[in-house]
């Protein structure tokens, strides 16, 4: 559940090679201010980030737990064919599992959150073979495709 040292891979980045003393950001700041990059805009930015970040956190939780599991007894569990069920066990009781269970039980669906819509749309498109580039782009922007694929591939989506 740690947030430490987690890379925000949902965001593109490019390292600046500019000397900070001649930073073009400084020169463009009047323009930025006139366009209004203050608290109201930041609030909107945070709104857009909230759903993305939650999915990213879920994926990170899954990655961390997979890594812990692998380090702990990877050989034995692969030999026994219990890797998938063990990962589910690690997720049990944790926030990722809680949210997935919350979606599955329909509580989220009643509130029509974007997460449910994305999961269900992806499921439909996989089913009818129309998983489009457009959907790929949307999911990339949400940093959610890996998580959703993982959802589809696990028993959690059996909705038992």
């Amino acid at each position: 559940r740690s947030l430490q040292d987690t890379e925000e891979k949902s965001r593109s980045f490019s390292a600046s090679q500019a000397d900070p003393l001649s930073d073009p950001d400084q020169m463009n700041e009047d323009k930025r201010h006139s366009q209004g990059t203050f608290t109201s805009d930041y609030s909107k930015y945070l709104d857009s980030r909230r759903a993305q970040d939650f999915v990213q956190w879920l994926m990170n939780t899954k990655r961390n737990r997979n890594n812990i599991a692998k380090r702990h007894d990877e050989f034995e569990r692969h030999a026994e064919g219990t890797f998938t069920s063990d990962v589910s066990s690690y997720l049990e009781g944790q926030a990722a599992k809680e949210f997935i269970a919350w979606l599955v039980k329909g509580r989220g669906r009643r509130d029509f959150p974007e997460e449910v819509a994305i999961v269900e749309e992806l499921g439909r498109r996989h089913a009818d073979g129309s998983f489009s580039d457009e959907m790929n782009t949307i999911l990339d922007n949400l940093a959610a495709r890996d998580f959703i694929n993982w959802l589809i591939q696990t028993k959690i989506t059996d909705r038992k």
């Epitope: 947030l3 040292d5 890379e7 965001r11 930025r32 945070l46 939650f54 956190w57 974007e114 997460e115």
Partner: antibody, heavy 119, light 112 residues
Amino acid sequence: QVQLVESGGGVVQPGRSLRLSCAASGFTFSTFGMHWVRQAPVKGLEWVAFISNDKNNKFYADSVKGRFTISRDNSRDTLYLQMNSLTPEDTAVYYCAKESILAALFDYWGQGTLVTVSS
Amino acid sequence: DIVMTQSPDSLAVSLGERATINCKSSQSVLYSSNNKNYLAWYQQKPGQPLKLLIYWASIRESGVPDRFSGSGSGTDFTLTISSLQAEDVAVYYCQQFYTVPTFGLGTKLEIK
């Protein structure tokens, strides 16, 4: 381990400028948003500015708008805060803070650098 | 902006006893789409950087002792230290990160 070290603080007269720096280490600087937060004795902790990892998004508190500029150099793992037209109300300890995977949540802070605006 | 109100301003508790700090937000910080409260707790010791203790109201950050716990939902939140240790003497701040971040004014925790 993650370390954030601020520098550039000092005593400055009203109306003058100051540039703060924050040297980051122990994490992949170019993949995280960064913030400046200040702490004044009376006002407490106050968020000042944010810059996204790719520099495409910058936001400022209304109290510093038009006067402060946040920037970063990902090749140098350094965050900056250019402060112009300083007033006594800007007197505070200024902290740089690393954003966690969750927006506007700060998982690491620097020790802070004191800025005193006084005539 | 969301206003964060902490109480009490200061608190003196005996070693080994329970310490409780309250935080109230001027509007809900619950995000209905994931049922998470966007509320964090930080610890500030003299001469040290602030330290993240709790986020999403109740999730302990890695490395934080389990005597620290967070609870609450909507607008009312609590940080509890189940058995106060000498090293817990500090100022504690709540922060909402639902929207433009704002902080409480802090609660100074001392040993009685």
